[in-house]
């Protein structure tokens, strides 16, 4: 025999004191998929969480970070304060990147500059912190008499040494 | 820096009641939920509820949903905790705390003693 | 409710020593453990979240690791000032629950 609980869409439950009548979900709460016989409470994106997705009949809310924070964990059941640009988040909290290395991000590692030499390429723009290097053309593609750009030797940033 | 501020001890006759503040400074208070926690030797730590400062908005422990009430001030950046009807179960260390999925920042904890 | 259950309430060791303490969870928590640490004073100050991270100012003698329902706090180079009792903590569902605390002590 077939359960009628299994006819109730996503968006109701099977509402056993009604005869296992579908009944829609009550305000504040849904259901994801069919032949539920409860609905489930709304997650609610309070404090440091706010709300990226209302919730509906058949989904759960989402929510993210305030600004200053990012999300961690399945659902985002966490938040994280950011770090700033040319820092990265470590077990010690927010550093600043070491010399030759850069994060444009709030979020994420920071990454070596890229080589120019590996590509044949010159330096262009010096790498900081915050920016990659650009790489500008390689020497053979400057027109003859053209004075190549050359890499300058990578000069510390005033009060960044090294970690 | 981030900083709880929790008031002084309490020593309260069984049956009345208590309020307890929490005053928070270092950061925007209203951005994030305060919690409250009750700490006994026998129990432990206990999540009594929470608090959204923004809205108002409440979520309690059912077990603490009759003997707590949780209410914020945004003017002046403090969270209350009110216990009723007070008896020697309600002797404890009660800690507020701020929640980002964690709770990242600690009261200094206030001592109520329930005793005639 | 989602139980948390510290079974060693107290542990003695020797400074230098590696610690390791553990925590169970009553269902999946999805790595959402946090591990608290109070000092003799009351003080109450977090040391990780979301299992494996180490909160800002925290000694990188910490460090915390588990997934489903068993995780662990090991302190990997024992000192005095880790004189205390540790709380895991889940942030999965309400209510937030606690451990029952370890408590350690110097041998």
């Known amino acids: 025999l077939q359960d009628p609980c299994s006819n109730c869409p996503a968006g109701t439950f099977c509402d056993n004191n009604r005869n296992q009548i579908c009944s829609p979900c009550p305000p504040n709460s849904f259901s994801s998929a069919g032949g539920q016989r409860t609905c489930d409470i709304c997650r609610q994106c309070k404090g440091v969480f706010r709300t990226r997705k209302e919730c509906s009949s058949t989904s759960n809310a989402e929510c993210d970070c305030t600004p200053g924070f990012h999300c961690l964990g399945a659902g985002c059941s966490m938040c994280e304060q950011d770090c700033k640009q040319g820092q990265e988040l470590t077990k010690k909290g927010c550093k600043d990147c070491c010399f030759g290395t850069f994060n444009d991000q709030k979020r994420g590692i920071c990454r070596p500059w890229t080589n120019c030499s590996l590509d044949g390429k010159s330096v262009l723009v010096n790498g900081t912190k915050e920016r990659d290097v650009v790489c500008g053309p390689s020497p053979a593609d400057l027109s003859p008499g053209a004075s190549s750009v050359t890499p300058p030797a990578p000069a510390r940033e005033p009060g960044h040494s090294p970690q | 820096q981030v900083q709880l501020q929790q008031s002084g001890a309490e020593l309260v006759r069984p049956g009345a009641s208590v309020t307890l503040s929490c005053k928070a400074s270092?950061?925007?208070?209203?951005?994030?939920?305060m919690h409250w926690i009750k700490q006994t030797p026998v129990h432990g730590l206990g999540w009594i509820g929470a608090?959204?400062?923004?809205?108002?908005?409440?979520d309690y422990n059912q077990k603490f949903k009759d003997k707590a009430l949780l209410t914020a001030d945004k003017s002046s950046n403090t969270a209350y905790m009110e216990l009723r009807s007070l008896t020697s179960e309600d002797s404890a260390v009660y800690y507020c705390?701020?929640?980002?999925?964690?709770?990242?920042?600690w009261g200094t904890g206030t001592t109520v003693t329930v005793s005639s | 409710d989602i139980q948390m259950t510290q079974t060693t309430s107290s542990l003695s060791a020797s400074l230098g020593d590696r610690v390791t303490i553990s925590c169970r969870a009553s269902?999946?928590?999805?790595?959402?453990l946090n591990w608290y640490q109070q000092k003799p004073d009351g003080t109450v100050k977090l040391l990780i979240y979301?299992?494996?991270r180490l909160h800002s100012g925290v000694p990188s003698r910490f460090s915390g690791s588990g997934s489903g329902t068993d995780y662990s706090l090991t302190i990997s180079n024992l000192e005095q000032e880790d004189i205390a009792t540790y709380f895991c903590?889940?942030?999965?569902?309400?209510?937030?629950?606690f451990g029952g605390g370890t408590k350690l002590e110097i041998r």
């Open positions: 705390t701020r929640d980002l999925g964690y709770f990242d920042v």
């Open positions: 270092g950061y925007t208070f209203a951005g994030f939920e």
């Open positions: 608090i959204d400062p923004k809205t108002g908005g409440t």
């Open positions: 269902q999946d928590i999805r790595s959402n």
């Open positions: 979301y299992t494996s």
């Open positions: 903590q889940q942030s999965e569902k309400l209510p937030r629950t």
